[in-house]
């Protein structure tokens, strides 16, 4: 089964600013990526960004910058201020739709003991959700 990995990092310069990186390990052509927080997309989660390889990128506050890193991975920077800013135990989820294969979603949150600015290399996410 294809895997989705999710990596959450708190920025050292802005302690309430987060970077989420997600990647897809599988076959097919990625047709859509949806990033949400507070739970899986469509199951209580709130959409932060939608990335389409041809139609472009849409993002919603507190998302500041969503972009493609490679053909199969994305990153999203979240603003660190305001009532809607994330906290340390917020769950972030990424859903990859891959044509004509399927769609897969995984979730992750900030590691409990993580130091700002430090992060482990991406590994398959602990939560892998196949819709």
């Amino acid at each position: 089964t294809p895997e989705v990995w999710v990596q959450v990092r708190m920025e050292a310069t802005e302690l309430s600013s987060f970077t989420i990186r997600c990647g897809f390990l599988g076959s097919g052509s990625i047709s859509l990526v949806t990033v949400s927080w507070g739970g899986p997309n469509g199951a209580g989660g709130t959409t932060l960004a939608v990335l389409h390889p041809e139609r472009g990128i849409r993002q919603w506050a507190p998302a500041r910058q969503a972009r493609w890193e490679t053909q199969s991975s994305i990153s999203l920077i979240l603003e660190g201020s305001g009532a809607s800013s994330p906290c340390a135990n917020t769950t972030f989820c990424c859903k990859f739709a891959s044509f004509p294969e399927g769609s897969w979603e995984a979730c992750g949150s900030l590691p409990p003991s993580s130091d700002p600015g430090l992060s482990a290399p991406p590994t398959p996410a602990p939560i892998l959700r196949a819709d």
Epitope: S27, S98, P100, E101, S103, D131
Partner: antibody, heavy 113, light 107 residues
Framework: EVQLQQSGPVLVKPGASVKMSCKAS????????INWVKQSHGKSLEWIGL????????NYNQKFKDKATLTVDKSSTTAYMEFNTLTSEDSSVYYC??????WGQGTTLTVSS | DIQMTQSPSSLSASLGERVSLTCRAS??????LNWLQQEPDGTIKRLIY???SLDSGVPKRFSGSRSGSDYSLTISSLESEDFVDYYC?????????FGGGTKLEIK
């Protein structure tokens, strides 16, 4: 691993409709779209369309959009393809596939009066 | 629709021989190409995805490569069970399209 079991061979008359099934084992589609593919006798393969079992969303090959209807029953983890207004040109083997990796054994459709 | 021209349509070869099958795409498809194997009873199995990635459980004698718009499936040393049909499949754009197939026969 997703295993797909397709319904048996069918013989129908021209002008009729037929509905074939594709049952996923283990009570899950495991995230995979269900693709449907046509193989005419001794010929190559043609993609008919796909359905996303999670939400019922479909994507059809324009050539088949008025001929095929794809549906899914999540409770029984079964995908269906209905073919309407059948002619002899529709006599073929039809495959369902989970993505492009897991393939059913095929359903033979014969249209004859 | 993207046309996939597969050659040869049939190929006679001997056990242990190295063979290559080719598909040419009518438009740019990047690496969005799979190779499928079909047995006489109709059973279909994916061998290669994304041009060159081997599916799990597929013998290492199978490999995939690309040169421009030409995509190749190579079998390094033919075994008896390899004498079946092969198809390429592009999925760069909808609808996905298949090559016409290659029938691999024993000499």
């Amino acid at each position: 691993e997703v295993q797909l079991q397709q319904s048996g061979p069918v013989l129908v008359k021209p002008g009729a409709s037929v509905k074939m099934s594709c049952k996923a084992s283990g009570n899950t589609f495991n995230g995979y779209y269900i693709n449907w593919v046509k193989q005419s006798h001794g010929k190559s393969l043609e993609w008919i369309g796909l359905i996303d079992p999670s939400n019922g969303g479909t994507n059809y090959n324009q050539k088949f959009k008025d001929k095929a209807t794809l549906t899914v029953d999540k409770s029984s983890t079964t995908a269906y393809m209905e073919f309407n207004t059948l002619t002899s040109e529709d006599s073929s083997v039809y495959y369902c596939a989970g993505g492009t990796v897991y393939w059913g054994q095929g359903t033979t459709l014969t249209v004859s009066s | 629709d993207i046309q996939m021209t597969q050659s040869p349509s049939s190929l006679s070869a001997s056990l242990g021989e190295r063979v290559s099958l080719t598909c040419r795409a009518s438009q740019d498809i990047g690496n969005n190409l799979n190779w499928l194997q079909q047995e006489p009873d109709g059973t279909i199995k994916r061998l290669i995805y994304a041009t060159s990635s081997l599916d799990s459980g597929v013998p290492k004698r199978f490999s995939g490569s690309r040169s421009g718009s030409d995509y190749s499936l190579t079998i390094s040393s033919l075994e008896s069970e390899d004498f079946v049909d092969y198809y390429c499949l592009q999925y760069a754009s909808s609808p996905p399209t298949f090559g016409g197939g290659t029938k691999l026969e024993i000499k």
